[in-house]
């Protein structure tokens, strides 16, 4: 009786279970009653990353330097090339097909998480007691100066964009 299901790493064809091709190899011909599945290695710069019955290998991704891309992991017969972005840039999508510059956090906002090759800068508003007076992709919100520790008093209140201004204490006669 012909099988209706096959074991792992096999596939059903012509009422017969044939072995799948291993990663890094493509299918040339299905097995028969008398012959094994015929597989062939993928060509250089091509890959297949699963046990398969594909007749064509996939092309390695190209990390195009003109798009700001660079290689993170070289492709092999079993794995695709993994791209990332050059310094100062990050991927526009999960598949990392192009790169854009990291955004800066505007005054009043600080960097919560510095950008990487695959993620943009994450900014956060400076809470009370903190400020940022620059547009930066690296600087966190900084705490207001503590006038008291310098034996000074607050002459001008701080904001999320400006530090407090300290001044001498008024001497009472």
């Amino acid at each position: 009786e012909p099988p209706t299901a096959c074991r792992e790493k096999q596939y059903l064809i012509n009422s017969q279970c044939c072995s799948l091709c291993q990663p890094g190899q493509k299918l040339v011909s299905d097995c028969t009653e008398f012959t094994e599945t015929e597989c062939l290695p993928c060509s250089e710069s091509e890959f297949l990353d699963t046990w398969n019955r594909e007749t064509r290998c996939h092309q390695h991704k190209y990390c195009d330097p003109n798009l700001g891309l660079q290689v993170q992991q070289k492709g092999t017969s079993e794995t695709d090339t993994i791209c990332t972005c050059e310094e100062g840039l990050h991927c526009t999508s999960e598949s990392c097909e192009s790169c854009v510059p990291h955004r800066s956090c505007l005054p009043g906002f600080g960097v919560k998480q510095i950008a990487t090759g695959v993620s943009d800068t994450i900014c956060e508003p400076c809470p009370v007691g903190f400020f940022s007076n620059v547009s930066s992709a690296f600087e966190k919100c900084r705490p207001w100066t503590s006038c008291e520790t310098k034996d000074l008093v607050v002459q001008q209140a701080g904001t999320n964009k400006t530090d407090v201004v300290c001044g001498p204490q008024d001497r009472q006669r």
């Epitope: 290695p41 710069s45 390695h60 190209y62």
Partner: antibody, heavy 119, light 113 residues
């Protein structure tokens, strides 16, 4: 028998140009990626450039980017390295080497051709 | 770029004795997809081009004597010659085959004591 034979090396002045060739035989050239690697006199190995089997993928070392161009002609079983704006620090023995689609390593190296950049 | 650091710079070993050299990479050479470490060793004899010795950290190239063995994973790798022969006098280079730019260690020169 796998053979890789380079030519085109020689003495050139700073700012000058040179084109290296690597003739391949004994294997199906169009099935292999190819690299150029150089070795300054008495020094270690430095990777220069790579081109995939079908010409689709090309990578360069930062030290040569914008000055060197790797190319190949599969019909002629030949690999090339066009070197422009040459500098004294480009003086080296230049090797072509092939990369197969299994190991993804440089499995055969040519004998090398010497490039000397000097005024 | 991945920096490859080899030690020692040179090694003098008696014939028939063991020679061991180290290679460290500044980041992991483990391919996450197939779990292979893409660390390659090349041998360069005086006046000759380099020759592929070992790939994937520990797989000997066809024709390479079994006295040569490679080991390690991630960032720490070792090449061992179990019983040094006169024809093993050479410089041995480890190479990052994991990512571009491909980078080489500075080499370990093996001599006979």
């Amino acid at each position: 028998e796998v053979q890789l034979v380079e030519s085109g090396g020689g003495l050139v002045k700073p700012g000058g140009s040179l084109r290296l060739s690597c003739a391949a035989s004994g294997f199906t050239f169009s099935d292999y990626g190819m690299h150029w690697v150089r070795q300054a006199p008495g020094k270690g190995l430095e990777w220069v450039a790579y081109i995939s089997s079908g010409n689709r993928i090309i990578y360069y070392a930062d030290t040569v980017k914008g000055r060197f161009t790797i190319s190949r002609d599969n019909a002629k079983n030949s690999l090339y390295l066009q070197m422009n704006s040459l500098r004294a620090e480009d003086t080296a023995l230049y090797y072509c080497a092939r990369q197969d689609g299994y190991r993804y390593a440089m499995d055969y190296w040519a004998q090398g051709t010497l490039v000397t950049v000097s005024s | 770029d991945i920096v490859m650091t080899q030690s020692p710079d040179s090694l003098a070993v008696s014939l028939g004795e063991r020679a061991t050299m180290s290679c460290k990479s500044s980041q992991s050479l483990l391919n996450s997809g197939n779990q292979k470490n893409y660390l390659t060793w090349h041998q360069q004899k005086p006046g000759q081009p380099p020759k592929l010795l070992i790939y994937w950290t520990s797989t000997r190239e066809s024709g390479v004597p079994d006295r040569f063995s490679g080991s390690g994973s991630g960032t720490d790798f070792t090449l061992t010659i179990s019983s040094l022969q006169a024809e093993d006098v050479a410089v041995y280079y480890c190479q990052n085959d994991y990512t571009y730019p491909l980078t080489f260690g500075g080499g370990t020169k093996v001599e006979i004591k």
